[in-house]
């Protein structure tokens, strides 16, 4: 009871002057509050509160539910309390069966005793099951039993308060502990696709998956740099306790070019926030853009291989691809494949494999591709480099020696005179006339060059060499001369191949 010091307000006095009182069920509770400035009695148990404005609290026939704390308050706001136990052998515990705990926090199992003289006040598992090994608790007869540092593993744990009364173990009604998880990480968010490419009028639909320990995770779709509320649909599942998944689907039923932009799926919990974005590009119509991977003018040596390679962007998906040469479509020798297996891939590769090219196979090779909206093509000009071939080497009636050579690039023809029997023809002879014969003909294939010299310039026996050469190689033809008197006579010409 409070001690009184004169001059300053003191708390009320209670009779009987005890901190605790034990009353048998059915007997009277009589409590007197002594204070000149009495205001009220308050009774509290299990979050229930009753008030009485009389200075004497009387309960004629006490019941177990009258167990609790009785507080007398005066006009100065000062108070004194007494705790009354109403001992009822048939009702040892008062219970509030709702039991919730927050992970890592303590929680109170509300089962205060009606008899403080019982022993072994503790918790027990239902149906004789043991409590979790790490479950620690602290009993308090007036409040109940506090479970220390609640774990997730205790969720839906069934338990009883227990006490030994006159040598017998008594159990309370059962409690089911519901554990609210602590958010110990940000939500896990993912998006169905990182980017979307659509044509005007097509539907845009994107799904964000949010995973967390509770459905109390907040999530929303936002458009970057916009406050407009977006329309979303949700689906959610509990994959067991503390394993929650929500799918938030954002839909624009008929996308417009100005819907293009970045959309963010944002989620947060009490730990923090996370987000993931997706990019939408809406085009007014489909497109195809072709990028050659090699120069579109190709020079290749006779007999060698070349690969014509293009990359192209196509949206929507390409429907027809073909390689064409001289109005002929290739049925094999080419392949077409997506640049990546990614679902949103719009980039493709096409390769035409030309093998052991002949001089006659130069020309324009065209790649054509189309989708439902557009067609596109790219041409490669293929030039086959061939060493010169001497087509004709003749002595004309007018005394001219003529050499005609074909090759690519355009051959150059040089003339040499070898006097007598010398093998090396070093003295060069200037031609009288040089003509490119097919300069106005087809743009690919061999170029034909004709060169002539005047044989009257030669006064001695010997050999005339016509040498045709280009970057690839050289070929020679020879004219043998012998003088009989004043007559110049051409011995059969012959050619020598010089690689």
């Amino acid at each position: 009871q409070p001690s009184v010091s004169p001059g300053e307000p003191s708390p009320p006095s209670i009779h009987p002057a005890k901190s605790e009182l034990i009353v048998r069920v059915g007997n009277e509770i009589r409590l007197l509050c002594i204070d000149p400035g009495f205001v009220k009695w308050t009774f509290e148990i299990l979050d229930e509160t009753n008030e009485n404005k009389q200075n004497e609290w009387i309960t004629e026939k006490a019941e177990a539910t009258n167990t609790g704390k009785y507080t007398c308050t005066n006009k100065h706001g000062l108070s004194s309390s007494i705790y009354v136990f109403v001992r009822d052998p048939a009702k040892l515990f008062l219970v509030d069966r709702s039991l919730y705990g927050k992970e890592d926090n303590d929680t109170l199992v509300r089962c205060p005793l009606t008899d403080p003289e019982v022993t072994s006040y503790s918790l027990k598992g239902c149906q004789g099951k043991p409590l979790p090994k790490d479950l620690r608790f602290v009993p308090d007869p007036k409040a109940g039993i506090t479970i220390k540092s609640v774990k997730r593993a205790y969720h839906r744990l069934c338990l009883h308060c227990s006490a030994d009364q006159e040598g017998k173990s008594v159990l309370s009604d059962k409690f089911i502990l519901k554990v609210r998880p602590a958010f110990k990480a940000v939500p896990v968010v993912s998006v169905s696709k990182a980017s979307y490419l659509l044509r005007e009028g097509e539907e845009f639909t994107v799904t964000c998956t949010i995973k967390d320990v509770s459905s109390s995770v907040y999530s929303t779709w936002k458009r970057e740099n916009s406050q407009t509320k977006l329309q979303e649909k949700y689906n959610s599942w509990h994959h067991g306790d503390f394993n929650y998944e929500r799918q938030a689907t954002l839909t624009i039923s008929s996308a417009r070019v100005n819907d293009s932009g970045v959309f963010m799926c944002y989620a947060n919990n009490t730990f923090g926030s996370a987000n993931v974005t997706t990019t939408l590009e809406v085009v007014d119509k489909g497109f195809i853009n072709i990028f050659p991977m090699i120069n579109t003018t190709v020079f290749v040596n006779d007999g060698e291989n070349v690969d014509l390679i293009v990359e192209y962007e196509a949206f929507p998906k390409p429907e027809h691809q073909q390689w064409i040469y001289m109005n002929r479509t290739f049925t094999d020798k080419w392949e077409d494949y997506p640049k990546s297996e990614n679902e949103s891939n719009i980039r493709y590769v096409s390769e035409l494999h030309l093998t052991r090219l002949k001089g006659t196979e130069g020309g324009t090779y065209t790649f054509l591709v189309s989708n439902s909206d557009v067609n596109a093509s790219i041409a490669f000009n293929v030039y086959v480099n061939t060493k010169p071939e001497i087509l004709t080497y003749d002595r004309l009636v007018n005394g001219m020696l003529q050499c005609v050579a074909a090759g690519f690039p355009e051959p150059t023809i040089d003339w040499y005179f070898c006097p007598g029997t010398e093998q090396r023809c070093s003295a060069s002879v200037l031609p009288v006339d040089v003509q490119t014969l097919n300069a106005s003909g087809p743009p690919f294939g061999k170029l034909v060059v004709q060169s002539s010299i005047d044989s009257s310039a030669f006064k001695h026996n010997g050999t005339v060499e016509c040498k045709a050469y280009n970057d690839v190689g050289k070929t020679s033809a020879y004219f043998n001369f012998a003088f009989k008197g004043n007559n110049k006579e051409q011995i059969h010409p012959h050619t020598l191949f010089t690689p």
Epitope: S215, S216, N235, D241
Partner: antibody
Amino acid sequence: QVQLVQSGAEVKKPGSSVKVSCKASGGTFSLYAISWVRQAPGQGLEWMGGIIPAFGTANYAQKFQGRVTITADESTSTAYMELSSLRSEDTAVYYCARGGLDTDEFDLWGRGTLVTVSS
Amino acid sequence: DIQMTQSPSSLSASVGDRVTITCRASQSINSYLNWYQQKPGKAPKLLIYAASSLQSGVPSRFSGSGSGTDFTLTISSLQPEDFATYYCQQGVSDITFGGGTKVEIK
């Protein structure tokens, strides 16, 4: 024992809003899941949404998304449900119940609040 | 949403009868199924939670069974106070209730 005490009946005009309260007496209100379930005359039960006050974020049934707002005031142990753009088919008894989120069963119910929407 | 189909929608029985009500989910809900009893003009009352656990204070004549998609509520011996409407409810996804089964006196 804990009780859920709901506000009284309401008569509302179409297009208006209604806000119903649900006060919990005792217990650890902040950790409860408080849900709202409605029942139209002669019909079944329909979950509208719920909230765990300690976490603050409400969950809503897809049907009511954007039209219902559920809040909770931990200081007064009271949950609220506001339904906007009322139409005649919203005439129903609106129950608050403990449970309904994170797989909690509805183990405690309020007595219900009749909301009549009529012009 | 997960659809909950209850059958029958109504049944007539006599005191002492064994009554069985079934509830089928449109997809698996594990054991996240609860049963409620509702009397006219009253709020529903929880009978069974987690498919088979009896709520405190509910008479032992009520029992529940099942998991996945098929569930059953059984009243072993119908009592006069059991005439009411019974609802099942799933809690794995956005909460949905079955359409109800009205148990009437024969």
